[in-house]
């Protein structure tokens, strides 16, 4: 059974994941982002179901494509590079989903834009956090 300290740790990790996903989304949605139109042409796989931490496997599998799309913003001077953000997200995802059980991700039939993809995982984080508080 999860202890209050492990629940607190999970909540903090989810909050950090949420913050970095929101940061990426904000940067993409910035009206001054000249690469937004091109970024929106890339398609991402969406999870068929995302209600438990094990479903983060579906996010993990899309992190490399996400980094590649974010690298389109190469004309900017980065405080944080896309690889810094993706690396941190990857570490959090691995800790949250655990490695005890192998979960095969099932994807929805329709793909999504980067904005829809990020919004989906932001909603996931918010939903899980709400069950922990």
């Amino acid at each position: 059974a999860p202890t209050s300290s492990s629940t607190k740790k999970t909540q903090l990790q989810l909050e950090h994941l949420l913050l970095d996903l929101q940061m990426i989304l904000n940067g993409i949605n910035n009206y001054k982002n000249p690469k937004l139109t091109r970024m929106l042409t890339f398609k991402f796989y969406m999870p068929k179901k995302a209600t438990e931490l094990k479903h983060l496997q579906c996010l993990e599998e899309e992190l490399k494509p996400l980094e590649e799309v974010l690298n389109l913003a190469q004309s900017k001077n980065f405080h944080l590079r896309p690889r810094d953000l993706i690396s941190n997200i990857n570490v959090i995802v691995l800790e949250l989903k655990g490695s005890e059980t192998t979960f095969m991700c099932e994807y929805a039939d329709e793909t999504a834009t980067i904005v829809e993809f990020l919004n989906r995982w932001i909603t996931f984080c918010q939903s899980i956090i709400s069950t922990l508080t």
Epitope: L19, M23, N30, D84, I89
Partner: nanobody
């Protein structure tokens, strides 16, 4: 408006340590990047370390393994622990607050704190 107050600079011998702090106040959003840049006389401003509110960090090779950035989101404060300092680390260190991971005209900068590494 965002106000940034830096502290912790000073004179230190080569091989020594210093800890810089920067507290942000004003129109702070929960999603942000805070960090440190430095500028030595006659040189361009350069990144020292940056950290997102979610914990993502960036260090240039010149400080990797020697400097550690951390933050307290509840206090809107960022810290820079500088170990194994070298004379070439001498510069004015500026705290930075940004709403995105890339540079923007809406970024905010502190007044700067002098770090001098000399025997």
């Amino acid at each position: 408006e965002v106000q940034l107050v830096e502290s912790g600079g000073g004179l230190v011998q080569p091989g020594g340590s210093l800890r810089l702090s920067c507290a942000a106040s004003g129109s702070i959003f929960s999603i942000n990047v805070m960090g440190w840049y430095r500028q030595a006389p006659g040189k361009q401003r350069e990144l020292v370390a940056a950290i997102s509110s979610g914990g993502s960090t960036n260090y240039p090779d010149s400080v990797k393994g020697r400097f550690t950035i951390s933050r307290d989101n509840a206090k809107n404060t960022v810290y820079l622990q500088m170990n194994s300092l070298k004379p070439e680390d001498t510069a004015v260190y500026y705290c930075m607050y940004a709403s995105s991971w890339y540079e923007d005209e809406t970024d905010y900068w502190g007044q700067g704190t002098q770090v001098t590494v000399s025997s």
